[in-house]
């Protein structure tokens, strides 16, 4: 028996359902009584779901997995994972045994988009050219951790005096806070871009300083 899975990682958004595709080519006369199917976590060998002795043995993994029972006899051994969490991310191995056995691993990549950045300025009044200001760009509830880029009004990257920190919440999602310290010109726009590297999603925030008032 030969097992086939997707070469590319399966990308799933947090709280959505994902299908880890796995298939085999059944011989003529194949019956489910002959099938032993096991899904497990590749690295820890933890059992996720199994089908043995002609029946679905159910989920061994937080009761959020399911097979496609009507499609098994056609060689579809795919696994449905419901309400995906950050902790589900990783490699899953599909083992199929009929008379001989084969296995293959498929990678699950979890992602969550970042919110539109909020911008704060310190100090936020009585600003004059030549003043040192701290601009903070904050974006929330994304995964995996973000890349943050700063640019001035002409699109020139600002790399000095930038400090970026990540904060993981209880669900494993990240809040990102990036701080730019800059000396004010006569007027200017400062933009931050928060990029999710998996989704290639860019979230933009900017602040324009033109004396008073400030524009966010």
């Amino acid at each position: 028996v030969e097992v086939q899975v997707s070469e590319d990682p399966v990308v799933a958004l947090v709280d959505t359902d994902a299908t880890l595709r796995c298939s085999f080519s059944p011989e003529p006369g194949f019956s489910l009584a002959q099938l032993n199917l096991i899904w497990q976590l590749t690295d820890t060998k933890q059992l996720v779901h199994s089908f043995t002795e002609g029946r679905d043995q159910g989920s061994a993994y937080s009761n959020r997995t399911a097979l496609f029972p009507d499609l098994l006899v056609q060689g579809n051994a795919s696994l449905r994972l419901q309400r995906v969490r950050v902790t589900d991310e990783g490699s899953y191995t599909c083992f199929v045994s009929i008379q001989d056995f084969d296995s293959a691993a498929v990678s699950l990549q979890v992602a969550a988009p970042y919110s539109k950045p909020s911008m704060t300025l310190e100090p936020n009044k009585d600003l004059r050219p030549g003043n040192m200001v701290t601009i903070t760009c904050s974006s929330y509830q994304g995964y995996p951790e973000a890349e943050v880029f700063w640019k001035d009004g002409q699109g020139v990257p600002l790399t000095g005096n930038v400090t970026t920190s990540q904060m993981a919440n209880e669900r494993g999602l990240f809040d990102v806070h990036s701080v730019l310290r800059v000396v004010l010109g006569a007027n200017g726009t400062y933009s931050c871009l928060v990029r999710n590297p998996v989704l290639q999603q860019d979230a933009h925030g900017s602040v324009t300083i033109t004396g008073q008032p400030l524009t966010f």
Epitope: D43, T87, E89, P144, E145, E147, A168, L173, P197
Partner: antibody
């Protein structure tokens, strides 16, 4: 079994460079963030640097090494690197390669045995 | 930067007794705290993560508790191999990922 094996340590003079390697096995290397942690003689543990998983190469550094050290990884070779430039006496330490337990929880579930870097004139 | 303060610096305990180690964070880390054991001449070993979850292969005489800013590692009955240095580490807010200064558990 998970194994992390560091190499590349040695004795160098201040201002010189060194490149550390960490060969990983027993897990899907590309799926995990990796770190360097160091320990000066008789002192506690100090986190040095972290690199994101897959090929995203998002990196973080302790302030004490920023601009001098560069972390990188080669997922095809299951190897983590630390390029250390402009070395100082205070960089003398055992350098450990450590695997992040998960990509959102940066505790270190597996450590190498370490490689000693001595910076001395 | 979140600062972790461990106490006591050294704890003298007899084998078979209970040891209680403390770690205090300068600001809340929720439950994002780990404990490590380091025996002389060896690499650190993960004992506890998420404040109270035991790592794979760690005996149940090790337990962790606490959340927010105050955390405790308890070794219920000290075995000879438990005499070592113990470190806490936070991973709530980074960089940097920070460690406590360590507590040495020595034989009384």
């Amino acid at each position: 079994d998970v194994q992390l094996v560091e190499s590349g340590g040695g004795v160098v003079r201040p201002g010189e460079s060194l490149r550390l390697s960490c060969a990983a096995s027993g897990f899907t290397f590309s799926n995990y963030a990796m770190n360097w942690v160091r320990q000066a003689p008789g002192e506690g543990l100090e986190w040095v640097s972290r690199i994101n998983y897959k090929g995203y190469n998002i990196t973080y550094y302790a302030d004490s090494v920023k601009g001098r050290f560069t972390i990188s990884r080669d997922n095809s070779k299951n190897t983590l690197y630390l390029q250390m430039n402009s070395l100082r006496a205070e960089d003398t330490a055992v350098y450990y390669c450590a695997k992040s337990g998960s990509n959102s929880n940066n505790f270190f579930d597996y450590w190498g045995l370490g490689t000693l870097v001595t910076v001395s004139s | 930067e979140i600062v972790l303060t461990q106490s006591p610096g050294t704890l003298s305990v007899s084998p078979g007794e209970r040891a209680t180690l403390s770690c205090r964070a300068s600001q809340s880390v929720n439950s994002k705290l780990a404990w490590y054991q380091q025996r002389p001449g060896q690499a650190p070993r993960l004992l506890i993560y998420d404040a109270s979850s035991r790592a794979t292969g760690i005996p149940d005489r090790f337990s962790g508790s606490g959340s927010g800013t105050d955390f405790t590692l308890t070794i219920s009955r000290l075995e000879p191999e438990d005499f070592a240095v113990y470190y806490c580490q936070q991973y709530k807010n980074w960089p940097p990922l920070t460690f406590g200064g360590g507590t040495k558990v020595e034989i009384k």
